[in-house]
Interface confidence: low
Amino acid sequence: KSSNLEGRTKSVIRQTGSSAEITCDLAEGSTGYIHWYLHQEGKAPQRLLYYDSYTSSVVLESGISPGKYDTYGSTRKNLRMILRNLIENDSGVYYCATWDG
């Protein structure tokens, strides 16, 4: 089930070619696999990567360019994702999600 994530909608505007950082706040005890999704208007949500909080490692979905996204941060409090070399097609709503059980 979906679990332990603090929702906080935030708008970020960046120029093409620049970077952006998104924060996912985790409730205490939120561990396991934390997923990042991109939802663009008219499309189904697309998983970009997931973060294994047990080993602090990142697994990219196939087709995602290494270096495009970087996820890091606390495995107990929050998780950040950096988006690099932004293009117009990166526009959309980014979500983090986790499951337990």
Epitope: S53, T55, S57, V58, D70, T71, Y72, T75, R76, N78
Partner: antibody, heavy 125, light 106 residues
């Protein structure tokens, strides 16, 4: 098997320089962040420096910042630590250490699963 | 920069349980990882992350975290568990180690 072999230690006078090397084998060297950790005689472990898998990010303990430089040569599977302006308090065994998780890890992550045997650096006049 | 504080020494009777702690502000946000160093040997990763052990490390080693404290518990301590135990975690500038705890099995 995974192996890290340090070299380059020795006796140096205060103010002098040394370059430590660490030859890595048994794993894909350029997929892993690496660290240098030191241990003064009879003392605990002290992290010295880390470098990202690609070598683009480096970081240093405050005690060595500006004096030590970490680098890596992927073609030679070798990690380096250039130590300048050495002080008596730099005397220690220096360990080359592999990060536990691969490319996705940023250089400052701290799970360290393979340690070399260490090389002794003595700074004394 | 952060500091991690460990008790200098603890002792435990053979087969009994011992817990060693690691305290520091960085542990409010990041898990510790734990290393054992026996005399004359290099450190060995014992536990990392939430509660993960590398292959070859027995399940009598476990960890927990609360607030600014990380704990390593050895349940049913064996003679071979003797050694110096170090915690480490993230630091504002990289990585920080605790000062180490000497564990003696009686």
């Amino acid at each position: 098997q995974v192996q890290l072999v340090e070299s380059g230690g020795g006796l140096v006078q205060p103010g002098g320089s040394l370059r430590l090397s660490c030859a890595a084998s048994g794993f894909t060297f350029d997929d892993y962040a690496m660290h240098w950790v030191r241990q003064a005689p009879g003392k605990g472990l002290e992290w010295v420096s880390g470098i990202s898998a690609g070598g683009g990010s480096t970081n240093y303990a405050g005690s060595v910042k500006g004096r030590f430089t970490v680098s890596r040569d992927t073609s030679k599977n070798t990690l380096y630590l250039q130590m300048n302006s050495l002080r008596a308090e730099d005397t220690a065994v220096y360990y080359c250490v592999k990060s536990y998780v691969d490319t996705a890890m940023r250089y400052y992550y701290y799970y360290m699963d393979v340690w070399g045997q260490g090389t002794m650096v003595t700074v004394s006049s | 920069s952060y500091e991690l504080t460990q008790d200098p020494a603890v002792s435990v009777a053979l087969g009994q349980t011992v817990t060693i702690t690691c305290q520091g502000d960085s542990l409010r946000n990041y898990y510790a990882s734990w290393y054992r160093q026996k005399p004359g040997q290099t450190p060995v990763l014992v536990v990392y992350g939430k509660n993960n052990r590398p292959s070859g490390i027995p399940d009598r080693f476990s960890v927990s975290a609360s607030g600014n404290t990380a704990s390593l518990t050895i349940t049913g301590a064996q003679a071979e568990d003797e050694g110096d135990y170090y915690c480490n975690s993230r630091d504002s500038s990289g990585v920080v180690f605790g000062g180490g705890t000497k564990v003696t099995v009686l």
